[in-house]
């Protein structure tokens, strides 16, 4: 007896973080035996969409002509072959930006910092929010994620960096969000350029440092989901 059908691959073009009103295409790639593709959104009351395969039948296109809050969320896809439905794909998290007004990002005491010293990036929103996210351009995992406990609403989040090294230099933006949907983000803040000047000693971050020290933004996953009980706003890792 044949084993379960291999799971399809799910991805989004031009990417999985989409501004409000922009178009996005979700692709599901299965096998040449696929007769139909289905897209399911997590916690939705019915199948999200179904499409016939494009020739040569190994993938299907799900088009979103204009991104809105309706489409933000976590998706999986399946394909149906003559022997039944496949296993689900790995999830795709589709995030919409532009749901709320943009926060302000600043550096304390200054965006000009000497290597080995400390700097804190401060993300401030006009209205109270419970999740703040920090992005560094061109980082492999470009997000730090701070969330308040018990949905407590705050106007700002601090992202301390210590000790600063040359790898911390670069362009940052921050987003704010409400906890009821981690897939809806604010407009991005204006960019902040963090400039790290050299010193006699240029300490490199230790790979074995504890999580209680601030990690570099490139060390964090894109959409953390785990949580640990803390008071105030704290960092969360998957």
């Amino acid at each position: 007896q044949a084993g379960p059908l291999p799971k399809p691959t799910l991805w989004a073009e031009p990417g999985s973080v989409i501004s409000w009103g922009n178009s996005v295409t979700i692709w599901c790639q299965g096998t040449l035996e696929a007769r139909e593709y289905r897209l399911d959104k997590e916690e939705s009351p019915a199948p999200w969409d179904r499409q016939n395969p494009l020739e040569p039948k190994n993938k299907a296109r799900f088009s979103i002509p204009s991104m809105t809050e309706d489409y933000a969320g976590r998706y999986r896809c399946y394909y149906r072959s003559p022997v039944g439905w496949s296993q689900p794909s790995d999830p795709l998290e589709l995030v919409m930006t532009g749901a709320y007004s943009k926060p302000t990002l600043s550096a304390l005491p200054s965006p000009l910092v000497t290597s080995g010293k400390s700097v804190t990036l401060l993300c401030q929103s006009r209205s109270p929010m419970d999740t703040f996210l920090l992005i560094k351009e061109r980082a492999a995992h470009p997000l730090l994620h701070l969330r308040s406990e018990h949905g407590a609403q705050q106007h700002q989040a601090e992202f301390p960096m210590s000790p600063v090294t040359s790898v911390h230099g670069g362009t940052y933006r921050c987003f704010s969000s409400h906890g009821f949907s981690h897939y809806l983000l604010s407009h991005p803040s204006d960019p902040l350029e963090l400039i790290v000047s050299g010193s006699l000693e240029d300490p490199r971050p230790s790979p074995t440092r504890s999580v209680s020290t601030a990690a570099g933004p490139e060390d964090q996953p894109l959409m953390p989901t785990g949580s640990v009980p803390h008071s105030g706003l704290r960092r969360h890792w998957e």
């Epitope: 916690e43 009351p45 019915a46 199948p47 309706d70």
Partner: antibody, heavy 122, light 109 residues
Framework: QVQLVESGGGVVQPGRSLRLSCAAS????????IHWVRQAPGKGLEWVAV????????YYADSVKGRFTISRDNSKNTLYLQMNSLRAEDTAVYYC???????????????WGQGTLVTVSS | DAVVTQESALTTSPGETVTVTCRSS?????????ANWVQEKPDHLFTGLIG???NRAPGVPARFSGSLIGDKAALTITGAQTEDEAIYFC?????????FGGGTKLTVL
Amino acid sequence: QVQLVESGGGVVQPGRSLRLSCAASGFTFSNYGIHWVRQAPGKGLEWVAVIWFDGNNKYYADSVKGRFTISRDNSKNTLYLQMNSLRAEDTAVYYCARDVITLVRGVPFDYWGQGTLVTVSS
Amino acid sequence: DAVVTQESALTTSPGETVTVTCRSSTGAVTTSNYANWVQEKPDHLFTGLIGGINNRAPGVPARFSGSLIGDKAALTITGAQTEDEAIYFCALWYSNHWVFGGGTKLTVL
């Protein structure tokens, strides 16, 4: 045209069982999820359960969970509701209602049957 | 358990715009609740009007529209007709179950 016809209602004693059926026609049954919804005399609507097109996803209201089972036979274009351990508060008209093929292209609860009355009384 | 609340009754005149609202006891109604609207006419004739991803069921007149207004779901009838006199139920989805509101009796005088 789309038609949903419920049957199987009647008078039953508390603690006993009953099975309702919903016969569908006028559309490709195997493409659609189907709901059971009930309305107690003089009351509003209460959602009971839904089953997805392929029978693999089933959801229930807390008030019937563990007592009622929704199922379907796509080869017979028929939906079922097996009701066990019936209580007086289950007395209602039971309707089947069509769900969507997909959320991006349809409206849940778009077509309804005429209902079948279940009376639980000693 | 979540409770969904609607106005018990509303009265409007032909040609007027009327809005039926739907509130959730758990907080703001969001797109994740997939607000759905069902019309009940005399003799227990039920019809789905609006739901899914802001879809209008085939044959439902364009004067019926659904939206989120503030923290509630809303059904707006723009230019009500006498035949719109009915009971309107909203249904909200809560991750793994639907909950219906108590219904709004709309009178068109």
